[in-house]
């Protein structure tokens, strides 16, 4: 004969755990149904009646199967230096990430709590390490033979142009100025030489934030320590 399927609530066999999407209720001492994402427990189970679930109210959510009596509050609206990369729904929290030109100075479980503008390297300094979603730009002084004449969070130090005859020597914040004869730009060996000076300023585009993967928010799933142990913690 096939094993009989138990309907919630039911008393688990000694030493066994509740099934997927069920939890062990310590008061009722029964395996009872969890509520689906987007819902919460409105009425807990008894020995003879199963859990009653209800939808999360506006601006609240549950991301996992759960038996919490109240949904979690969505985070506050994204600030002006942020973009909303995931909206608040009944099943997921709002995620705010930093807008281009900013980085996350204080992260939270998902998204960013505090954004800060990317550092701009002043003339005489270039970008040594570009900014990322979570780290600021690192500037370095331009080495001899290179310069940066901009205040920028993306510009690196560039080589001075090579003059046949130098009118004004270059320094860390200014390119060399040549006399009327055509200058040649300092290039890597084997590179094509251009007849006139050309702006070769590198354009560092900001990395586009990737959507965060959902963390395992185990606090959504109350876990009773007494046997029999809880069933699944997720789906």
């Amino acid at each position: 004969l096939p094993a009989q399927v138990a309907f919630t609530p039911y008393a688990p066999e000694p030493g066994s755990t509740c099934r997927l999407r069920e939890y062990y209720d310590q008061t009722a001492q029964m395996c009872c149904s969890k509520c689906s994402p987007g819902q919460h427990a409105k009425v807990f189970c008894t020995k003879t009646s199963d859990t009653v679930c209800d939808s999360c109210e506006d601006s609240t959510y549950t991301q996992l199967w759960n038996w919490v009596p109240e949904c979690l509050s969505c985070g506050s609206r994204c600030s002006s230096d942020q973009v909303e990369t995931q909206a608040c729904t009944r099943e997921q929290n709002r995620i705010c990430t930093c807008r281009p030109g900013w980085y996350c100075a204080l992260s939270k479980q998902e998204g960013c709590r505090l954004c800060a503008p990317l550092r701009k390297c002043r003339p005489g300094f270039g970008v040594a390490r570009p900014g990322t979603e979570t780290s600021d730009v690192v500037c370095k002084p331009c080495a001899p033979g290179t310069f940066s004449n901009t205040t920028s969070s993306t510009d690196i130090c560039r080589p001075h142009q090579i003059c046949n005859v130098v009118a004004i020597p270059g320094n860390a914040s200014m390119d060399a100025v040549c006399t009327s004869t055509s200058p040649t730009r300092s290039m890597a060996p084997g590179a094509v030489h251009l007849p006139q000076p050309v702006s070769t300023r590198s354009q560092h585009t900001q990395p586009t934030p990737e959507p965060s993967t959902a963390p395992s928010t185990s606090f959504l799933l109350p876990m009773g320590p007494s046997p029999p142990a809880e069933g699944s913690t997720g789906d």
Epitope: T27, V43, F44, K47, S49, V52, P69, P222, G224, P225
Partner: antibody
């Protein structure tokens, strides 16, 4: 609005059975998720949970008193009853009944009834 | 049975002070804790449910926090009407009350 009121004998002697009644209005014990519980408080001391009964007649008792307690209900008359057998002077207390929310906390309380066990 | 350890048993505060009461449980109760206020000769009144959710009518100077086995209740700006005894209740595994904390004004 929700109201609960306890009634009892006032005074009784050791070894007798204490019978308490909780009469309520503003909610029904036929409503899914609703429960009524009993809590007591000896004079100048703390609160002690005794027993609960739910809309579906599921019952829970304080393990340390379980063999002396019986809770029951009369849904149509909006009443819940508690019996405590073999009372002793230690059972002298104010007895409260309270409504229980579907997620199990006591949200509305009666005014309490004083019960004295004395020989 | 779950044992609740509420402390302190009594405390004295000046008006405007912040006071904190703690409740420790003998096992994880998954935030199923409520806080009650009882004035002399009156029935208890519920202030907070599920660790931190204020009941309708509870002033915002009252707050609760905690998880697992450690919970706390605070009054941020004590007023004379707060003179009472405060009880925690765990309802994660049957029901158990703490022993109470009597708040007095200096």
């Amino acid at each position: 609005q929700v109201q609960l009121k306890e009634s009892g004998p006032g005074i009784l002697q050791p070894s007798q059975t204490l019978s308490l009644t909780c009469t309520f209005s503003g909610f029904s014990l036929s409503t899914y998720g609703v429960g009524v519980g009993w809590i007591r408080q000896p004079s100048g001391k703390g609160l002690e949970w005794l027993a609960n009964i739910w809309w579906d007649d599921d019952k829970y008792y304080n393990p340390s008193l379980k063999n002396r307690l019986t809770i029951s209900k009369d849904t149509s008359n909006n009443q819940v009853f508690l019996k405590i057998t073999n009372v002793d002077t230690a059972d002298t207390a104010t007895y409260y009944c309270a409504r229980i929310d579907g997620t199990r906390y006591f949200d509305y309380w009666g005014q309490g009834v004083m019960v004295s066990v004395s020989s | 049975d779950i044992v609740l350890t509420q402390s302190p048993p009594s405390l004295s505060a000046s008006l405007g002070d912040k006071v904190t009461i703690t409740c420790q449980t003998s096992q994880n109760i998954n935030k199923f804790i409520a806080w009650y206020q009882q004035k002399p000769g009156k029935a208890p009144r519920q202030l907070i449910r599920y660790t931190s959710t204020l009941m309708s009518g509870t002033p915002s100077r009252f707050s609760g926090s905690g998880s697992g086995t450690d919970y706390s209740f605070s009054i941020s700006n004590v007023e004379s009407e707060d003179i009472a005894t405060y009880y925690c209740l765990q309802y994660g595994n049957l029901w158990t009350f703490g022993r109470g904390t009597k708040l007095e004004i200096k």
